[in-house]
C-alpha cells in the first residue's frame, strides 16, 4: 500500500524533518504550512489548523518562503545619485544603484547604500585604474614623456608628440609643440 | 471596543479546586485566530503564564502546571474557564485573562481578580 | 522551556531621561518579544510586539530592538505616566515572562 500523505498540520515522524514549503512550529509541535513569497503569516498554525497567509501590504516584501507575522519595509526611494534597477515589489525589495559616473561607496545586501561621485584626476594625472561600480577612480602623476591636461575620471596619460624640431617641451599637464615641420607620434 | 473581566471565588481552602471564568466582549472566540489566555501574578512577584485557548479548541498549557489545569471555552456565551485543582497558597495571586492574536502575543488584558488561598 | 532574564529588576530615572530595560533568552526566539507596561490595579498594556513593532495609539518614545536571544526595549524622553512596571514576553515557543522592571522617579 502507498504511504498515506500528509496535510499540514501533522506530527513529524521522530527524528525526521518537515517537508519542503513546511516548517516545525514549536509551539504546536507540528509541521505547518509556510507563506508563499509575497504573503507573511496572519495566524499561526495550531495542532489542528494550518497557517492562514495574507498578502504584503503596500511597499513591503517577503522573498522567500516564510512564517514571519509581518513583511519586511522595502527600502527608502533611490536618492538623485541612484538609479532604481528593481522596484519594490510584495515579493522583492527595491534595489538603487548609483547612476554612471558614480560608484558604490558604502554597498547593503543588495544594490547600494550610498553613492559618491568618482574622482577625477587633474592636469598632470592619468586614471591609473578606473573606477567600477563599487571601487573609486585611482590616479597617478604622468610620467615622463606622457601627459594629461584633462580633468577626467577616465583618461589615461598619453605619451608627448614627437616632433622633428620641439617649439615648446611636453610637461605632465601639456602635450609638446612642434614647429611646423610635421610631426611623428 | 475590546473588554474582558475575570471572576473568581476571591478567598478558597487549600486543596479545593479553584474555578476562574473570563467574560469577554468585542471578539468572538469563533473567529479565524482568536485565542483567550490565563495569566496570574502573586503578590510582589511577576507574572507567569497558566493556559490558552484557540478558536479551534486546541490548548496549550504551563508544562510545570499541566496536570493541574483544565481551560476551557462557552463560545456562544464569550466565556472562558480555568479550573485549578488541588489549590495551594502558592495560588494565591490576582489571576489575568487576555486576548491572544493570532501570532501569539496577548494584545488586550482584564483587570484581574484576586484569589487567596487560605486554611 | 525558555527562560526570560530581564534586567535591571529596579531603575531609578529622572524626568527627561532615556531608560533601556533589557531581556535576554535562553534560546533563539527569532524576535517573537513583546514589551507590556503595568501599573497597579490595571491590566497589563500592550507596548511593543514582534521586537520592535510599536502598537496603535502607543507614543513613540518607545521603542523595541534586538534578535537571537538578546532583546532590549528603551522610553526616551521619561514622562511621569511612564512610572509602572515593565515586562517582556517571549512567544516563540510556548510563552514566558520576564522577571520584571520597576521604574521609579528618581
Known amino acids: 500500500l502507498p504511504a498515506q500523505v500528509a496535510f499540514t498540520p501533522y506530527a513529524p515522524e521522530p527524528g525526521s524533518t518537515c517537508r519542503l514549503r513546511e516548517y516545525y512550529d514549536q509551539t504546536a509541535q507540528m509541521c505547518c504550512s509556510k507563506c508563499s513569497p509575497g504573503q507573511h503569516a496572519k495566524v499561526f498554525c495550531t495542532k489542528t489548523s494550518d497557517t492562514v497567509c495574507d498578502s504584503c501590504e503596500d511597499s513591503t516584501y517577503t522573498q522567500l518562503w516564510n512564517w514571519v507575522p509581518e513583511c519586511l519595509s522595502c527600502g527608502s526611494r533611490c536618492s538623485s545619485d541612484q538609479v532604481e534597477t528593481q522596484a519594490c515589489t510584495r515579493e522583492q525589495n527595491r534595489i538603487c544603484t548609483c547612476r554612471p559616473g558614480w560608484y558604490c561607496a558604502l554597498s547593503k545586501q543588495e544594490g547600494c547604500r550610498l553613492c559618491a561621485p568618482l574622482r577625477k584626476c587633474r592636469p598632470g594625472f592619468g586614471v591609473a585604474r578606473p573606477g567600477t561600480e563599487t571601487s573609486d577612480v585611482v590616479c597617478k602623476p604622468c610620467a615622463p614623456g606622457t601627459f594629461s591636461n584633462t580633468t577626467s575620471s577616465t583618461d589615461i596619460c598619453r605619451p608627448h608628440q614627437i616632433c622633428n624640431v620641439v617649439a615648446i617641451p611636453g610637461n605632465a599637464s601639456m602635450d609638446a609643440v612642434c614647429t611646423s615641420t610635421s610631426p611623428t607620434r | 471596543q475590546v473588554t474582558l473581566k475575570e471572576s473568581g471565588p476571591g478567598i478558597l481552602q487549600p486543596s479545593q479546586t479553584l474555578s476562574l471564568t473570563c467574560s469577554f466582549s468585542g471578539f468572538s472566540l469563533n473567529t479565524l485566530g482568536m485565542g483567550v489566555g490565563w495569566i496570574r501574578q502573586p503578590s510582589g512577584k511577576g507574572l507567569e503564564w497558566l493556559a490558552h485557548i484557540w478558536w479551534d479548541a486546541d490548548k496549550y498549557y504551563n508544562p510545570a502546571l499541566k496536570s493541574r489545569l483544565t481551560i476551557s471555552k462557552d463560545t456562544s456565551k464569550n466565556h472562558v474557564f480555568l479550573k485549578i485543582a488541588n489549590a495551594d497558597t502558592a495560588d494565591t495571586a490576582t489571576y489575568y485573562c487576555?486576548?491572544?492574536?493570532?501570532?501569539?502575543?496577548?494584545?488586550?488584558w482584564g483587570t484581574g481578580t484576586t484569589v487567596t488561598v487560605s486554611s | 522551556d525558555i527562560q526570560m532574564t530581564q534586567s535591571p529588576s529596579s531603575l531609578s530615572a529622572s524626568l527627561g531621561d532615556k531608560v533601556t530595560i533589557t531581556c535576554k533568552a535562553s534560546q533563539n526566539i527569532n524576535k517573537f518579544i513583546a514589551w507590556y507596561q503595568h501599573k497597579p490595579g490595571e491590566g497589563p498594556r500592550l507596548l511593543i510586539h514582534y521586537t520592535s513593532t510599536l502598537q496603535p495609539g502607543i507614543p513613540s518614545r518607545f521603542s523595541g530592538s534586538g534578535s537571537g536571544s538578546d532583546y532590549s526595549f528603551s522610553i526616551n524622553n521619561l514622562e511621569p505616566e511612564d512610572i509602572a512596571s515593565y515586562y517582556c514576553?517571549?512567544?516563540?515557543?510556548?510563552?514566558?515572562f520576564g522577571g520584571g522592571t520597576k521604574l521609579e522617579i528618581k
Open positions: 514576553l517571549q512567544y516563540g515557543v510556548l510563552w514566558t
Open positions: 487576555a486576548r491572544m492574536t493570532g501570532t501569539r502575543y496577548f494584545d488586550v
